[in-house]
């Protein structure tokens, strides 16, 4: 920043609440879509351009005037893998986090006209092109359909779909939110011959019911009913099928071949948790027991002579955890070699760090190809010579991310491709590879302004800068911006990382109010090297508040010793560690220990509430947005992963003594703002309603705000502005700021 170290002499404006709410300073992205190994699409002034990766030259793929007469606002587009058709999405209606319905039309790029015959129906739930060519699979009214050609009639694959009961090719609420992080439960084979799909049965799953108030003119509120399994409740069941799309005909029903779960899963409740095609005729399925410390991978081959799928027991791979649960949130996906006879997978090693292991399908044991007191975040690409991965190894910073390549013929030959490119500005990378990994886009998201660059895998040469946010940089030169500090403290001989957003002209000899921004859920990370323009930027820049975050026990990417510390004990160590962090920050000399606040959303709202209800005396006030209050109220898949079952034989005692309500009395010592959306399908309004009731019952005065018809994100334009304005007032009042 230009200007002076002296705050009084700095005449530049600060980053205001309005700047945040109106998004005055916009980070520019460079969102590309690879369409081959050397070409990508990029949208510029609503024209779709096709770029040559090697030379950087571009041509217009589709002019912005093409759909002037279309008559609908296009929400998204998707080009068929053979480049012959474009799928246009409109009439978008959001459902849950990932799910939505929409209308679709198909435009023939050769004929330069919309296809008017055999159109996809309105209110379609999911559509996807086959990986090659231009077949389409879609889900409508919970049933699956396939189009061999965009202008041909659809072949109906399933006939059992029923709203809120049977879901074919799409996920129910809990699978969408907690297992697949997607609405889709369809998986094309690499050449588009086979279509695999899951079927979920929610017949016995209890319904969550809540009012939706809608327009003022609605005399009686609508009741929304969603099959939602809470901890210990009846779960959905799952079946898995594969259909050969070459067999489809209008005059006979499609034959779907079922692949059943392994015997070790069928003995009790279980989940399907990963589907990965290994080759054209080999598929891997991962299954997980309801008690999520035991998973099995099946590898199944197509038998052409019988038309069935065979999963040999000798090829099963078991993954289990003795200290917690399998995977970070679920078992990681396998990355198969071209022949499908081996794969690479991120699993926990003996020391409890997540690293890449090399498996051969017919052998039980695997060979770790990475090791160290750091973790592999993700496998990004696999070629015949190299495996590319992102890790947080560099400089021992768990909150950093860099791209590495490892030579498959010699695992000792590891190269960091991003570490030294721009080490001051860029310490947190993600990557997007071309179809065969000949080129890659590096996306640096901090600590400096985001930077997007293109590279060649042949020599790892940087080809060009795609976006450097120089315009934003110039604008921010005229703003008093906060600085970000990323460091660690040592507790019980263990490093715990924190970040602080420090006010402009930060002076360690002065005393600042501190707001602890908390999430603290299992495998979370709030201390990182990412550049953000958010509410904290305003609080630090304009209100001179330090906004800190701390990754304590339970946090991720630092080994299972830290992450699994809270196994079966949510609401304990991760809560205590936030309190201890605040104490440590108080000792640093620049924190006004009479003005320490805490806030969080979702799991962060739970931890905030548990901290405020702890009676620690450290915090003056806090804000909980959409908090969990009792784990029996939250969904089965997430909750039971960490807590087991709420039964006397399992972990009922800790379910009962980890509630916010049981701490109600201690809220007399703090100022509390409780906020929730009434239409929260995820963390139900029930959770805050029960906190409110408990506080009222013991005579606690507190502040509360509900957001009518808002879901877990409270993201509508008006509600978003209202909540942050409201929270700002609360924090300023708490800190006695003008």
């Amino acid at each position: 920043n230009k200007g002076t170290d002296d705050a009084t002499a700095d005449s530049r404006k600060t980053y205001t609440l309005t700047d945040y709410l109106k998004n005055t300073y916009r980070l520019k992205l460079y969102s590309l879509r690879w369409i081959s190994d050397h070409e990508y699409l990029y949208k510029q002034e609503n024209n779709i351009l096709v770029f040559n990766a090697e030379y950087g030259n571009s041509s217009v793929f589709l002019e912005n005037s093409t759909f002037d007469e279309f008559g609908h606002s296009i929400n998204d587009y998707s080009i068929s893998p053979d480049g012959q058709f474009i799928l246009l999405e409109y009439n978008y209606v959001k459902q849950w986090r990932h799910s939505y319905t929409a209308s679709y039309d198909i435009y023939d790029l050769n004929k330069r006209q919309l296809i008017t015959e055999e159109r996809i129906p309105n209110n379609t739930q999911w559509v996807t092109w086959s990986p090659v060519g231009h077949k389409l699979a879609y889900v409508w009214n919970n049933d699956i359909y396939v189009k061999i050609e965009p202008n041909l009639p659809s072949y109906r694959i399933t006939w059992t779909g029923k709203e809120d009961i049977i879901y074919n090719g799409i996920t129910d609420w809990v699978y969408e939110e907690e297992v697949f992080s997607a609405y889709s439960a369809l998986w094309w084979s690499p050449n588009g011959t086979f279509l695999a799909y899951a079927q979920f049965n929610d017949t016995e799953v209890p319904l969550i019911e809540y009012s939706f108030y809608s327009d003022e003119s609605l005399q009686y509120p609508k009741t929304v009913r969603v099959p939602y399994p809470k901890a210990g409740a009846v779960n959905p069941t799952v079946k898995f099928f594969v259909v050969n799309t070459d067999s489809l005909s209008s005059v006979t029903n499609a034959t779907s071949i079922q692949i059943t779960a392994p015997a070790s899963m069928l003995i009790g409740d279980h989940y399907l948790c990963d589907v990965t095609w290994a080759t054209q005729e080999r598929i891997s399925l991962q299954w997980l027991r309801r008690i999520q410390n035991y998973s099995v991978m099946d590898i199944c081959d197509y038998d052409e002579s019988s038309g069935r799928w065979n999963c040999l027991v000798a090829r099963q791979h078991i993954e289990m955890s003795t200290t917690g649960w399998v995977g970070r949130f679920r078992p990681s996906e396998p990355h198969f070699t071209l022949d499908g006879n081996s794969f690479y997978k991120i699993i926990s090693n003996e020391e409890g760090y997540r690293h890449i292991c090399y498996f051969q399908i017919d052998k039980k044991d695997c060979t770790f190809i990475t090791k160290g007191t750091w973790e592999v975040i993700g496998i990004e690409a696999l070629t015949s010579d190299y495996l590319y991965y992102i890790s947080n190894e560099y400089k021992g910073m768990p909150g950093g991310r860099n791209l590495y390549k490892i030579q498959l013929s010699d695992y000792t030959k590891v190269t960091c491709l991003s570490c030294e490119l721009n080490p001051e500005r860029c310490q947190y990378y993600s990557v997007s590879f071309s179809k065969e990994a000949k080129y890659y886009q590096l996306r640096c998201s901090g600590p400096g302004l985001p930077l997007y660059t293109l590279h060649s895998s042949v020599n790892d040469k940087g080809l060009r800068v795609l976006e450097d946010n120089s315009a934003l940089d110039k604008m921010l030169q005229n703003v008093q911006m906060p600085s970000k500090k990323l460091d660690f403290i040592i507790l019980n001989e263990t490093k715990f990382w924190y970040q602080m957003i420090l006010p402009p002209h930060f002076d360690k000899s002065k005393k600042y109010p501190l707001l602890l921004d908390v999430y603290a859920g299992p495998c979370s990370q709030k201390a990182d090297t990412v550049f953000r323009l958010n509410w904290a930027t305003y609080l630090a820049s304009t209100e001179n508040i330090i906004v800190a975050s701390f990754d304590g026990r339970g946090s991720g990417y630092q080994g299972d010793k830290i992450m699994h510390a809270i196994n079966r004990r949510l609401g304990t160590f991760e809560v205590e560690d936030q309190i201890e962090a605040a104490r440590q920050f108080s000792k640093m000399g620049f924190v006004d220990n009479k003005r320490i606040a805490i806030w969080g959303w979702s799991y962060g709202g739970y931890v905030t509430s548990m901290v405020l209800g702890s009676g620690s005396g450290v915090f003056k006030c806090g804000i909980a947005v959409a908090p969990v209050s009792r784990w029996e109220y939250y969904d089965s898949v997430y909750t039971e992963r960490y807590m087991g079952l709420p039964t006397p034989e399992d972990n009922l005692d800790h379910y009962r003594n980890s509630t916010v309500m049981s701490r109600a009395e201690n809220f007399k010592q703090v100022e509390y703002l409780l906020i929730h959306g009434t239409a929260d399908d995820n963390v139900h309004f029930q959770q805050s309603a029960q906190i409110s009731k408990a506080l009222v019952d013991v005579g606690v005065d507190f502040q509360a705000m509900w957001y009518t018809d808002e879901d877990h994100g409270i993201a509508s334009s008006t509600a978003h502005q209202h909540i942050y304005t409201h929270m700002s007032h609360f924090i300023k009042q708490c800190f006695s700021l003008p």
């Epitope: 067999s247 005909s249 209008s250 034959t255 052409e304």
Partner: antibody
Amino acid sequence: EVQLVESGAGVKQPGGTLRLTCTASGFSLTTYGVHWVRQAPGKGLEWVGVIWGDGRTDYDAAFMSRVTISKDTSKSTVYLQMNSLRAEDTAVYYCMRNRHDWFDYWGQGTTVTVSS
Amino acid sequence: DILMTQSPSSLSASPGDRVTISCRASQDIRNNLNWYQQKPGQAPRLLIYYSSNLQTGVPARFSGSGSGTDFTLTISRLEPEDFAAYYCQQSIKLPLTFGSGTKVEIK
């Protein structure tokens, strides 16, 4: 390369049985259905029946009682058996591959004559 | 059963002529109609599937149109090798049925 070859041609006795073989190559009988169609001398095409990839069969009602279509996937062969032959069963019999809703490959045909 | 009626049953034409053959279904078959060509002593060959889609390798002078109950096969410029019998076939419902055929002869 996809090919279908019919065999079993010849002169059959009225009241007798014919068994035609269709040998397929270049595709899997567990994926694609195989149909039989016949064509009487100087006449049009008449659908007889089909065996689908999963082994299910469908027949024209006119042949239901006396026709059986079967297959041996290990030998890549499809069979058409017709009982109680009569003179009007004299025809060229074709087998064809089912590609979705059309017949994309046909055999060359095999001639069956029913005569005493 | 769905009855397929083809007309004319035969026609005479010269090379270079434009020829249209009609096929009518006894009920709505949407676009589920295919056209086949059969030369003497040979098996039929697929020309058009699903009313208007040209099978790979078939010359562009062949085209199909129609939906519901009325369909047309058009040969824009007749070539000597096009003299043959032509059959329509519905594929929407079992039993599958063919038209009785149209024989295109040299004038």
